[in-house]
Amino acid sequence: QSNCTCPTNKMTVCDTNGPGGVCQCRAMGSQVLVDCSTLTSKCLLLKARMSARKSGRSLVMPSEHAILDNDGLYDPECDDKGRFKARQCNQTSVCWCVNSVGVRRTDKGDQSLRCDEVVRTHHILIELRHRPTDRAFNHSDLDSELRRLFQERYKLHPSFLSAVHYEEPTIQIELRQNASQKGLRDVDIADAAYYFERDIKGESLFMGRRGLDVQVRGEPLHVERTLIYYLDEKPPQFSMKRLTAG
């Protein structure tokens, strides 16, 4: 049926076979029912993506414990709520532990590796480099535009965007959300950051044609490069101390 689609997630298959002929949408690759009035969890989106494939200074220094997603795409295991399972393994029985954004936080091991819990990522630092402009953006205007973006497009509660830093041409957006702060209907910072990342790359997960339209006082913001750092509530457990470069 033509009008049965999921506006917040392209990576779904929808039908009206549910009770009362209501439109229901399931994530590709997992068949989990998704709520199309809000963001889909990053785990289900990564799984769908893999299934589709088969088919003085103002800037923040990332903490020594911050980790970058260097491993890239993998086919994750999600729980029944669509969240990442603590232990992830590949087809060759290599396993590792992940945080709540699905990024590896331990060395890789074999199937005997134990991951006791999904450690929550409570701080995400999104670092953007913008294309050169005639003059630098006004920091206050940039701050309010990005806050507006995260609140409106990703429905992230304003309190979870803790700061916007700017030192031309680098912009840093800090998202902070402890488990205790996240209410039942609150969007997770992990999901907001992932949708934003895909939007910035021109790979929007939203169904409509309307893409990102970020402009500061009429001047478009064009992003050239993106780095995302993830800081967990507990330090990562790599065998050597490192801050990975992406």
């Epitope: 917040t8 009035s37 507006r148 497009r153 409509g208 044609r209």
Partner: antibody, heavy 126, light 107 residues
């Protein structure tokens, strides 16, 4: 105060074209999506189309798609609707409206309209 | 295309609480009051629950699932009008849509 002032209506001939203009004042025009909504005599409201802040994105109702063009001049704070190949069913009052949620994934929603113009009447008749 | 469903009419006595529902869209609902055909609509609620500063506090909106409700607490004679809900059609095209309108009669 937010003011939206439409003009350009009147008697039009079938097959012809019309150009409606909406002059905005009392707010930073560049910060808002803008809509056109119409109402046929004795009927309900009908969403016609939307344009985003920069003018880089437009979307139209199926009834006017291919015949309508919405444009804006942010310097002059004006919104325009060009509607070609006019039909009798295009008769009605045309309203210019402001959209309050420019970044929303569902920003084309008629539910984000927070201000309306007084309307301009269009009659398509031979 | 998707249709927003709202009752065609409701009636109430002055001082009563009126609830008008609108369903069938996603988030991003609004409510528009039109006192006479051809007169400019007035936004009473937009973006699910936001009320313009010039609208009395007796008007409120609430969203539950895919149903939005306009609530008028302590309805007054001057609230008699047609109320249109606006929303978002998720069918290909992803356009704005309006419900057919609800006529509120204050007895």
């Amino acid at each position: 105060a937010v003011t939206l002032d439409e003009s350009g209506g009147g008697l039009q001939t079938p097959g012809g074209g019309l150009s409606l203009v909406c002059k905005a004042s009392g707010f930073d025009f560049i910060d808002y999506d803008m809509f056109w909504v119409r109402q046929a005599p004795g009927k309900g409201l009908e969403w016609v189309g939307v344009i985003n802040r920069s003018g880089s994105y437009t979307n139209y109702a199926p009834a006017v798609k291919g015949r309508a063009t919405i444009s804006r001049d942010n310097g002059q704070s004006t919104l325009r609707l060009q509607l070609n190949n006019l039909r009798a069913e295009d008769t009605g009052t045309y309203y210019c409206a402001r959209g309050a949620c420019t970044h929303c994934w569902d920003a084309d929603s008629a539910g984000y309209i927070d201000a309306w113009g007084h309307g301009t009447e269009v009659i398509v008749s031979s | 295309a998707l249709a927003l469903t709202q009752p065609s009419s409701v009636s109430a006595n002055p001082g009563e609480t009126v609830k008008i529902t609108c369903s069938g869209g996603y988030s991003g609902y609004g409510w528009y009051q039109q006192k006479s055909p051809g007169s400019a609509p007035v936004t009473v609620i937009y973006w699910n629950d936001k009320r313009p500063s010039n609208i009395p506090s007796r008007f409120s909106g609430s969203l539950s699932g895919s149903t939005n409700t306009l609530i008028i607490t302590g309805v007054q004679a001057e609230d008699e009008a047609v109320y249109f809900c606006g929303g978002y059609d998720s069918s290909p095209g992803y356009v704005g849509i309006f419900g057919a309108g609800t006529t509120l009669t204050v007895l």
